[in-house]
């Protein structure tokens, strides 16, 4: 999906008002210095591409985050503010949801969510030069 036509400011508002709090809740009990940020993004569409991938695509050691509250809210925000997102993405993530077993918070998942926090912070500061 091409995130170029999203309403970035409205997605930012949804992140600041609710998604960010759910990410913090998920990471509660974890030190902010525990994980190094290894995933980066260069602009807002790129950030959303990376956020979409890390949130909804299963990775080794972290089968799925899609059922977490922050993920459901991310999906809702993208569905509302990114025209065409629902048609291209929702069915795929729903198929994954059916295959998924019980929720398990592994260290790998915590690391992945830490990366997500970094991506979201970068999304919110699009004018900053890439480090």
């Amino acid at each position: 999906y091409d995130f170029t036509n999203c309403d970035f400011e409205k997605i930012k508002a949804a992140y600041l008002s609710t998604i960010s709090k759910d990410l913090i809740t998920y990471m509660s009990g974890t030190k902010s210095t525990e994980f190094n940020n290894t995933v980066s993004c260069s602009n807002r569409p790129h950030c959303l591409t990376e956020i979409q991938s890390l949130t909804f695509n299963p990775t080794a050691g972290c089968a799925s985050l899609a059922k977490e509250m922050f993920a459901m809210k991310t999906k809702a925000a993208l569905a509302i503010w990114c025209p065409g997102y629902s048609e291209t993405q929702i069915n795929a993530t729903q198929a994954m949801k059916k295959r998924r077993k019980r929720k398990v918070t592994t260290n790998k998942c915590l690391e992945q969510v830490s990366q997500l926090q970094g991506l979201w912070r970068r999304f919110n500061r699009p004018l900053l030069k890439q480090q």
Partner: antibody
């Protein structure tokens, strides 16, 4: 069962406000959109706005911007639509309608409608 | 004045086919595959018939079909039956600000 139940008919004076409720049951309230649509006597359907409780997002039709407020109470699975500065042209049946999960612009479940009459 | 334009009326005899059009712009119908159609009988709430241009809602007979060409969407009812007599409304998604637009409605009469 899966349904939306709306509050009863209202008679209001011009210039006043009305608040209509819509109680959801049988589905996960927060994940869906709750839209509000009205129909004046003998007229067509008109969309007022939508709320997606999961993310607290509301979007209003330009025509009603500043005059309509849509809210939701997730603890009671109830959505509300308040319309202010009422005039006679606001006399209509007001429907709440569920927007499909993540496809909030398709209304797959409707309330029974609430008749709001604005008359002096 | 509705944002989407529908003919006020359409008619057909039992067994015949009838097509109802819904015309918009490139900012709504032409820009997205997010057209839906609703059936409304007198005194009743509307019912979703077609969504995503051509997908039938559950329980809707396959006599109802939807299509789109450019800025115009169409609802076709084939093998008309008496119970198909109702008002039909089209809607289209119209971007993140406008969100949803309704057509003015078409009264379908089964002769």
């Amino acid at each position: 069962q899966v349904q939306l139940v709306q509050s009863g008919a209202e008679v209001k004076k011009p210039g006043s406000s009305v608040k209509v409720s819509c109680k959801a049951s049988g589905f996960t309230f927060g994940s869906y959109g709750i839209n509000w649509v009205r129909q004046a006597p003998g007229q067509g359907l008109e969309w007022l706005g939508v709320i997606v409780p999961l993310v607290g997002v509301t979007i209003y039709a330009e025509k009603f911007q500043g005059r309509v407020t849509i809210t939701a109470d997730t603890s009671t699975s109830t959505a509300y639509m308040e319309l202010s500065s009422l005039r006679s042209e606001d006399t209509a049946v007001y429907y709440c309608a569920r927007g499909q999960e993540y496809f909030y612009w398709y209304f797959d479940l409707w309330g029974q409608g609430t008749l709001v009459t604005v008359s002096s | 004045q509705s944002a989407l334009t529908q003919p006020p009326s359409a008619s057909g005899s039992p067994g015949q086919s009838v097509t109802i059009s819904c015309t918009g712009t490139s900012s709504d119908i032409g820009g997205y595959n997010r057209v839906s159609w609703y059936q409304q009988h007198p005194g009743k709430a509307p019912k979703l018939m077609i969504y995503e241009v051509n997908k039938r809602s559950s329980g809707v007979p396959d006599r109802f079909s939807g299509s789109k060409s450019g800025n115009t969407a169409s609802l076709t009812v084939s093998g008309l039956q008496a119970e198909d007599e109702a008002d039909y409304y089209c809607t289209s998604y119209a971007g993140t600000d406008t969100f949803v637009l309704f057509g003015g409605g078409t009264k379908l009469t089964v002769l």
